[in-house]
Structures are given as C-alpha cells and as structure tokens.
Interface confidence: low
C-alpha cells in the first residue's frame, strides 16, 4: 500500500538535488583557493542533515548551524553587493566586478542559487513531488529558513559601504517583504556600516525619472536612517551601458550619468 | 584534451531507424556534473537540439522528436548511442555530439565542446 | 519550449566595425543559462559566450555578451576577418534546450 504523501503548494525538490549540490561545491572550491580545504563530502551531510527526517514547515535556523559552520568564509567587508528582485544583473556586475560579492558569489549561496529542496518528517527521503509554499504552506520550510540564516549572516558581515541593486521596473522598488527589505536591512550592523548605497536599475530606455525620489525609497531611506546607517542612492539609467562601463571603464563615452 | 567523434550511416532510407554513435575520450561520463547530448542541423539551416543523457543516466528530449528518440550511453567504452526511428527526407542533417559541462553557478548547461558531425541522408 | 529569436537574421558590415546581435526569449531566461556560439562554413560551432556575459577559453576580449530576463546580446566591438560566421544563442535553463535561429554576420 503506498504511503500517503503530502501534498505541498510549491514545486518539489529539485531533480538530482544532492548531485547539483555536491557537484557545486566541488567546482566552486576548485575555482576559488581560499575554500579548497572544505570536504564537499562533509558540506552534503551537513545540508542534508538540516531538512532529511524533519517536518518541512518546522525547520529553523539551529538545523543549518552544521552547514553554517562548514561553509564559514571571508569576504571582504567593504565589498559586498546586496540586490532585490534584480538577481541576474548583480550576478552579471560581480562576474565583471570580481572584488564585490553578493550572497551567491560566497560557497553556500552558490550551493543553494535556484534551487528547491524539503524532506519528510520520519523518512529518509528527500520529496521530489512537492515542498512548502512560503505563502500557501508556511514560513518555516528549508529553503526559506536557509535563505533568511544566510542572508542575515552576509549582512551581518559587512562593512563601510554596502551596495544594493534595486529593481526600477517593479512597482515596489523596495519592498519591505522582500529578502533584503525583511533580513537584510535590519541585520546590517551600525558599529561596522557607514552608508547604504542603493542603485536603482531602471528598465525602460526612454526613463529619465529619478527613480531615487520614488516612496518606497525614501522608505528605506527612513529605516535606514533610524538606525544610525547613512543612505544614498544613484539611477542607472542604461543597465546594459553600466555593465559595458565596468567592464571598460577607460571608454569615453563612460564619464557621462549612466 | 576533450574529443567527441561522431560515427553512424551516411546513407538511411525513409521509415528505417538510425543509430548514432558519439565516441569521446578526455573526460567520465560517470564523472558528476557531465553529459552528452545530440544537436543536428539541416543543410542551410539553424541548429536543432535533440537530447542529453547526464552522468546519472538522466535523460531529456526534444519535445518535437521525443517520441521518435532513444539516448543510452556505455560508460566503459565512453560512447552515447542516439536512435531516430521513422527517418524522413527532412531528417537530412550533419548531427553533432557535444559534450555538457558545469560552468560557475549553473545546474543546467551549455555545451561547450562539439564533435566535427556526422552528415546523414534521407533518401530512397 | 522556450523559443529563442535572433535579429537581424543577416548583418552586413566592414571589418572595423561593431556588431550588435540580439537574442530575445519567449519566456524569462536565468543569464546564467544563455550561451553563445559561432560557427563557421563546414565547421561545428563553438563555444563563445556561457553565463550570458563569461567568455570561454580562448575567445578573444572583442566579444562580449550582456542581458538578462528575455533579451540578451552579443557584441563584437571591431569585427576581424575571421569573425565573419553565423552566430548561434541557446539556452540551458528549461529542457529542451533551444536554439536561436541564428544571424549571419557578412563582409559588406
């Protein structure tokens, strides 16, 4: 008789999960010397044994404190690039900017970039079918928990200047449900951060609004000043030329507002 | 250094089954994170993707051709066969192997290295 | 399937000169899943462009891809003779895996 399974909202586990992970985490400490003492064998077992046997919406932040501590780096804390509903064009940024790192670009956001994973309480198994919803089933699942430990653990690492990319297209540019408007922001650490710069990416060619007077932003501005963080903010009118520009910052036509 | 050769028919008659052999040497198909898969190209034309076969014998399908398409591989001889059955004159391609690898950051891949292709022809 | 549609089809310019290929998808695509190739008359195509922006080993600083969502680009900042090839986007990031239709790039 088969074992009544249930039925989650979300998309299940992502197909070859444990390969994907294992198999990133090998390429990640080949390409990146300062990791390559980590035993990718050992970072498996840990993030295996956050979620394996554990009721998918009762996992919290303790369950990932193995893999937390396995997956300890240093980053430079001047140098780091939070984002919000704009992933692909930071990701883009650090791959040409190769001194600023956003949460990906460390070994256990990496390991975890777009994937899905969730087990079942008292069973080995890993669910292929379905895991929570953040919404539908509840908060507690494990990719939620293991983006919200990380995310607050990168934040908490920063320092002097700390970068955010904003999405200008999205009618929140901030959005206070957000990652970065729900963990990020609040975990930023007044003692050791002297100003938030947020750019906000702005998506139509023919936009030449100052998205940087826009409610959400002066929202943030507002949370941040209130805890004692400076704040400023910049337009990138044209993402595609900011990107060429990183890239060859010498190019003439880079001096002009981009 | 990373090869892939291609080798089957020159020469198939319509309704017959083709069977396409990619031979590699370089890199494990048991190696994680490697794959195989099939790309062909109408003379003159764009090219078309057929199918992957991964390390752990996961298998994808062009959705168009998915029912006409077996991909199997022999790890220890380092070879992928490819089956087309019911071949057709429109079948008429140079098919390419190419190899499937992890690049920074991805789960799903580009192929990054190609074998020279192998013409075959459709006709009675 | 994710359908990947390449402008212009032909593209005709002199040595020198810059090349800006367009490749824009039916449905929103990771950057770190598009590639771009070039191939060559009698040639399998090879590998240029992976991660939408990361060049593959040996591929000269002249090309450069950029985009995300659904519309991506590959540039060529000052065509050399042996650029001239038919250029080729794919995606990796919902089976099947697709390809571009192509653009030719010609000596004018």
């Known amino acids: 008789v088969p074992r009544w399974r249930q039925q989650w909202s979300g998309p299940g586990t992502t197909k070859r999960f444990p390969e994907t992970v294992l198999a990133r985490c090998v390429k990640y400490t080949e390409i990146h010397p300062e990791m390559r003492h980590v035993d990718c064998q050992s970072v498996w077992d840990a993030f295996k044994g956050a979620f394996i046997s554990k009721h998918p919406c009762n996992i919290t932040e303790e369950d990932y404190q193995p893999l937390m501590k396995l997956g300890t780096q240093t980053v430079p804390c001047n140098k780091i690039l939070l984002w919000s509903r704009i992933k692909d064009l930071a990701h883009q940024f650090t791959q040409v900017q190769r001194d600023m790192f956003t949460l990906e670009d460390t070994l256990l956001g990496y390991l975890a970039d777009d994937l899905t994973w969730c087990g079942e309480f008292n069973t080995s198994k890993i669910n292929y079918q379905s895991c929570p919803d953040w919404r539908k089933d509840c908060s507690n699942n494990p990719v939620s928990v293991f983006w919200k430990t990380v995310s607050r653990r990168f934040a908490e690492a920063a320092c002097d200047v700390v970068h955010v990319m904003l999405n200008g297209s999205r009618s929140k540019i901030f959005d206070k449900n957000s990652t970065f408007g729900s963990v990020e922001v609040h975990n930023l650490q007044p003692e050791k951060v002297q100003t938030l710069e947020a750019w906000v990416i702005h998506g139509g060619r023919e936009d030449s609004r100052d998205l940087c007077q826009d409610p959400t932003i002066k929202e943030l501005e507002s949370i941040i000043s209130k805890r004692n963080i400076q704040f400023s903010c910049k337009n990138i009118y044209r993402p595609d030329k900011f990107l060429q520009c990183v890239k060859n910052p010498e190019d003439s036509s880079c001096t002009s507002e981009i | 250094q990373v090869q892939l050769k291609e080798s089957g028919p020159a020469l198939v008659k319509p309704t017959q089954t083709l069977t396409l052999t990619c031979t590699f040497s370089g890199f494990s198909l048991s190696s994680d994170g490697m794959g195989v898969g099939w790309i062909r190209q109408p003379p003159g034309k764009a090219l078309e993707w057929l199918a992957l076969?991964?390390?752990?014998?996961?298998?994808r399908y062009s959705t168009s051709l998915k029912t006409r398409l077996t991909i199997s591989k022999d790890t220890s001889k380092n070879q992928v066969v490819l089956t087309m059955t019911n071949m057709d004159p429109v079948d008429t391609a140079t098919y390419y192997c190419a190899r499937f690898n992890w690049f920074y950051r991805l789960a799903f891949v580009n192929p990054d290295v190609w074998g020279q292709g192998t013409l075959v022809t459709v006709s009675s | 399937d994710i359908v990947l549609t390449q402008s212009p089809a032909t593209l005709s310019l002199s040595p020198g000169e810059r090349a800006t290929l367009s490749c824009r998808a039916s449905q929103s695509v990771s950057s770190s899943y598009l590639a771009w190739y070039q191939q060559k008359p009698g040639q399998a195509p090879r590998l240029l462009i992976y991660g939408a922006s990361s060049r593959a080993t040996g591929v000269p600083a002249r090309f450069s891809g950029s985009g995300s969502g659904t519309d991506f680009t590959l540039t060529i900042s000052s065509l050399e003779p042996e650029d001239f090839a038919v250029y080729y986007c794919?995606?990796?990031?919902?089976?099947?895996?697709?390809f571009g239709q192509g653009t030719k790039v010609e000596i004018k």
């Open positions: 076969i991964d390390w752990d014998d996961d298998k």
């Open positions: 794919q995606q990796g990031y919902n089976s099947p895996f697709t």
